[in-house]
């Protein structure tokens, strides 16, 4: 018979390892994207990052981040995004709602979108790791 498994209790070191990996991969992506010269960041795009009303790691907007990165993957064949997505999926609940992204059509605007989101993703992973470690410190004091 079909019985749902018990709710998975993940050790915090596993979650920290996932976010550390994402932080490292986000730097790799940004370095790769920044090689394209003459592209400026845009104020038109905002990557959702951390939610103030949830505890780490559920405060990371993983489904939305995944959708944005999937869009970049479709616009520009960055293989590092495959690995990023696999790690984000470790943080995404299987019933999480889908996020729709409106994709720029102009080639130069696409490049601005990729740079802007990649930069915000890198900053977001720095924040996520900080929120995790500060949360862990609070839990032990």
């Amino acid at each position: 018979s079909h019985t749902l498994p018990v709710r998975l209790l993940r050790p915090s070191d596993d979650v920290q390892k996932i976010v550390e990996e994402l932080q490292s991969l986000s730097k790799m992506l940004l370095k790769d994207v920044e090689e394209e010269k003459g592209v400026l960041v845009s104020q038109n795009y905002t990557l959702p990052c951390l939610s103030p009303d949830a505890q780490p790691p559920n405060n990371i907007h993983s489904p939305a981040i995944r959708a944005y990165l999937k869009t970049i993957r479709q616009l520009d064949n960055k293989s590092v995004i495959d690995e990023i997505i696999e790690h984000l999926d470790k943080l995404i609940f299987q019933d999480a709602p889908e996020t729709n992204i409106s994709v720029p059509t102009d080639t130069h605007e696409c490049k601005r979108f990729i740079l802007t989101i990649s930069q915000q993703f890198s900053e977001c992973m720095d924040l996520a790791l900080k929120s995790l470690t500060s949360g862990a410190q609070q839990a032990t004091t």
Partner: antibody
Framework: QVQLVQSGAEVKKPGSSVKVSCKAS????????MQWVRQAPGQGLEWMGA????????RYSQKFKGRVTITADKSTSTAYMELSSLRSEDTAVYYC???????????????WGQGTTVTVSS | AIQMTQSPSSLSASVGDRVTITCRAS??????LAWYQQKPGKVPKLLIY???TSASGVPSRFSGSRSGTDYTLTISSLQPEDVATYYC?????????FGGGTKVEIK
């Protein structure tokens, strides 16, 4: 109750292709990765690749890259694995497997198809 | 690719014996490891997921543990129906490779 039903046994000539199907019923998840695994006679389990059916996103083992194509039809809850340029060493039982759990990423494959025997012989 | 080194490749033990099978990952994979049992001519069956969580309906004599990059499947009291080949598989990042398998027989 989750059930995975695979297509029947196939006998193929070297150089040809085979397409194995895996139909899921009773499976309600939307965000998940499923995998294809094969087992040659008397050998261990070998990972071939995976698909995220909701988006058609795929990952392949380096060993099979260029020869294997994994696809999914959301409307019929069916996944497919096509292997081309068959050789005698591809004679094996091919399995599809699906995870259960609360996250999009798997941490174990709870459900397995019954296996499809593919024999490659001239 | 992450390598999973499983040992021993085969073992023979008596009914009631405690049996341990080990998988070593070539790098840190957290708890993203599963154990399967495959009886001759049958489909693999999930025993343990997330390194130490038992799958539904699995007898309590089967347990999983982790120490760093070493993962252990323990059968606390071997039964005749446990004759099978056991495999580990990691899920840290693709390719999700398997260990080479451990064939368990009764003395």
């Amino acid at each position: 109750q989750v059930q995975l039903v695979q297509s029947g046994a196939e006998v193929k000539k070297p150089g040809s292709s085979v397409k194995v199907s895996c139909k899921a019923s009773g499976y309600t998840r939307t965000r998940y990765w499923m995998q294809w695994v094969r087992q040659a006679p008397g050998q261990g389990l070998e990972w071939m690749g995976a698909i995220y059916p909701g988006e058609g996103d795929t990952r392949y083992s380096q060993k099979f890259k260029g020869r294997v194509t994994i696809t999914a039809d959301k409307s019929t809850s069916t996944a497919y694995m096509e292997l081309s340029s068959l050789r005698s060493e591809d004679t094996a039982v091919y399995y599809c497997a699906f995870p259960e759990g609360q996250y999009a990423a798997p941490y174990g494959m709870h459900y397995w198809g019954q296996g499809t025997t593919v024999t490659v012989s001239s | 690719a992450i390598q999973m080194t499983q040992s021993p490749s085969s073992l023979s033990a008596s009914v009631g014996d405690r049996v341990t099978i080990t998988c070593r990952a070539s790098r840190n994979i957290g708890n993203y490891l599963a154990w399967y049992q495959q009886k001759p001519g049958k489909v693999p069956k999930l025993l343990i997921y997330y390194a130490k969580t038992s799958a539904s309906g699995v007898p309590s004599r089967f347990s999983g543990s982790r120490s760093g990059t070493d993962y252990t499947l323990t059968i606390s009291s071997l039964q005749p129906e446990d004759v099978a080949t056991y495999y580990c598989q990691h899920f840290w990042k693709t390719p999700w490779t398997f260990g080479g398998g451990t064939k368990v027989e009764i003395k």
